[in-house]
């Protein structure tokens, strides 16, 4: 995300179109309190950050309240009055959607439909991952609404599920982040379970003739 400008690496995350977090890693200024200055309009004066993130006692980032802002963030990271990194970027392309809420499971024989509340903005993928203790890795299915039907499940097996939301790269570009995963929930025979057995009984070996 942030190439080096005077050795400064930056990362921007826009949490659910609510809060922007800009962090920096500047080896050249590792013992320095760099300051963060920003504006949402190219014609305004810069404001200084009022909510710094600290690492080992020095500034390492800034949190900005940016509820539903879809404009350009102009910012400057400074060592005193000297800018060490200056840029202006569309914030929406650093989107990290919120974790899926109100996740529900609707079972019908060998299939389950996973639903959750759709987020208010578009061009998202809702991804469900699932596995049984017999699976070596997670299986995945995704749709562009939070209504994902997974078929061909074995009603006798216990399955773990979790859900996340991703911005479509084709539309949002390469700098977005998937949401955090929802909590894992476990199901067997259409009923919720506390957990699925981690180590299933291994299949009996076939006797060679």
């Amino acid at each position: 995300q942030g190439g080096a400008a005077e050795g400064v690496q930056i990362q921007i995350i826009y949490f659910n179109l609510e809060t922007v977090q800009v962090t920096w890693n500047a080896s050249k200024y590792s013992r320095t309190n760099l300051t963060f200055h920003y504006r949402f309009n190219g014609d305004e004066a810069y404001d200084q950050c009022t909510n710094y993130l600290l690492q080992e006692g020095h500034t390492s980032g800034c949190l900005l309240d940016a509820e539903q802002r879809d404009d350009i963030l102009y910012f400057s990271i400074r060592n005193g009055t000297h800018p060490v990194f200056t840029a202006s970027r569309w914030m929406v392309y650093y989107l990290k959607p919120s974790s899926p809420k109100h996740v529900r499971f609707s079972w019908h024989q060998d299939a389950v439909t996973v639903t959750c509340s759709d987020l208010s903005y578009g061009d998202l993928l809702y991804e469900v991952q699932y596995r049984s203790p017999f699976d070596t890795e997670w299986q995945s299915k995704q749709e562009n609404t939070c209504n994902v039907t997974i078929e061909g499940l074995d009603a006798e097996k216990c399955y773990s599920f979790w859900v996340r939301v991703k911005a479509m790269e084709d539309v949002y570009g390469p700098d977005t982040y998937p949401s955090d995963w929802s909590e894992v929930t476990c199901w067997q025979r259409g009923e919720i379970r506390d957990a699925c057995a981690e180590t299933p009984t291994p299949p009996k070996p076939k006797l060679s003739k």
Epitope: T86, V92, Y94, V171, Y172, D175
Partner: antibody
Framework: EVQLVESGGGLVQSGGSLRFSCAAS????????MNWVRQVPGKGLEWVSS????????YYADFVKGRFTISRDNSKNTLYLQMNSLRAEDTAVYYC??????????WGQGTLVTVSS | DIQLTQSPSFLSASVGDRVTITCRAS??????LAWYQQKPGKAPKLLIY???TLQSGVPSRFSGSGSGTEFTLTISSLQPEDFATYYC?????????FGQGTKVDIK
């Protein structure tokens, strides 16, 4: 599939006005910034204007400030450029473009605006 | 505003040649640089974004490199369909700006 289709270019007298549009499909139009870029015949590409997804923030190149207005109608998935006080040097092909912070992948086919003096 | 200077402005080459185009920025732009190909009467086509990432569907003979102020577009083996004009664009800071273009012509 994302598509951008411009319409409304044409011949206009110097000092006159023209509005043209860009119809978008294949993505959630209201969630994304949009851009206008122009190209004078035989010359290079030149950014003209950008607008935020909601339409609440607009940005202009210095050479069009006060003369051009970018706008959008999210209910119609359409982007507009209103051009006033046109000059001969505004003669160009105008493109709408959609991208992200790293590059603009989607472009309209372009619409030619000719300003006669 | 950030100025981008492309060199050369004009380049004559033959099919099979290795071609390199340079784009220099007047100040650091991290890796926020894109490369476009444009043919007469057509809209620009995105080839490379984020300085070095190949856009899907673009042949692998195209590659981009660089960071900060100096960037290059390389065509490893020029094909007949590659004769066109190429532009760099910076998106690090508004306003976005383009290089003046490099026309690649048949020798």
């Amino acid at each position: 599939e994302v598509q951008l289709v411009e319409s409304g270019g044409g011949l206009v007298q110097s000092g006159g006005s023209l509005r043209f549009s860009c119809a978008a499909s294949g993505f959630t139009f209201s969630s994304h910034p949009m851009n206008w870029v122009r190209q004078v015949p035989g010359k290079g590409l030149e950014w003209v204007s950008s607008i935020s997804g909601s339409g609440g923030s607009t940005y202009y190149a210095d050479f069009v400030k006060g003369r051009f207005t970018i706008s959008r109608d999210n209910s119609k998935n359409t982007l507009y450029l209103q051009m006033n006080s046109l000059r001969a040097e505004d003669t160009a092909v105008y493109y709408c473009a959609k991208g992200h912070n790293s590059g603009w992948k989607y472009w309209g086919q372009g619409t030619l605006v000719t300003v006669s003096s | 505003d950030i100025q981008l200077t492309q060199s050369p402005s004009f380049l004559s080459a033959s099919v099979g040649d290795r071609v390199t185009i340079t784009c220099r920025a007047s100040q650091g732009i991290s890796s926020y640089l894109a490369w476009y190909q444009q043919k007469p009467g057509k809209a620009p086509k995105l080839l490379i974004y984020a300085a070095s990432t190949l856009q899907s569907g673009v042949p692998s003979r195209f590659s981009g490199s660089g960071s900060g102020t100096e960037f290059t577009l390389t065509i490893s083996s020029l094909q007949p369909e590659d004769f066109a004009t190429y532009y760099c664009q910076q998106l690090n800071s508004y306003p976005p700006t383009f290089g003046q273009g490099t026309k690649v012509d048949i020798k």
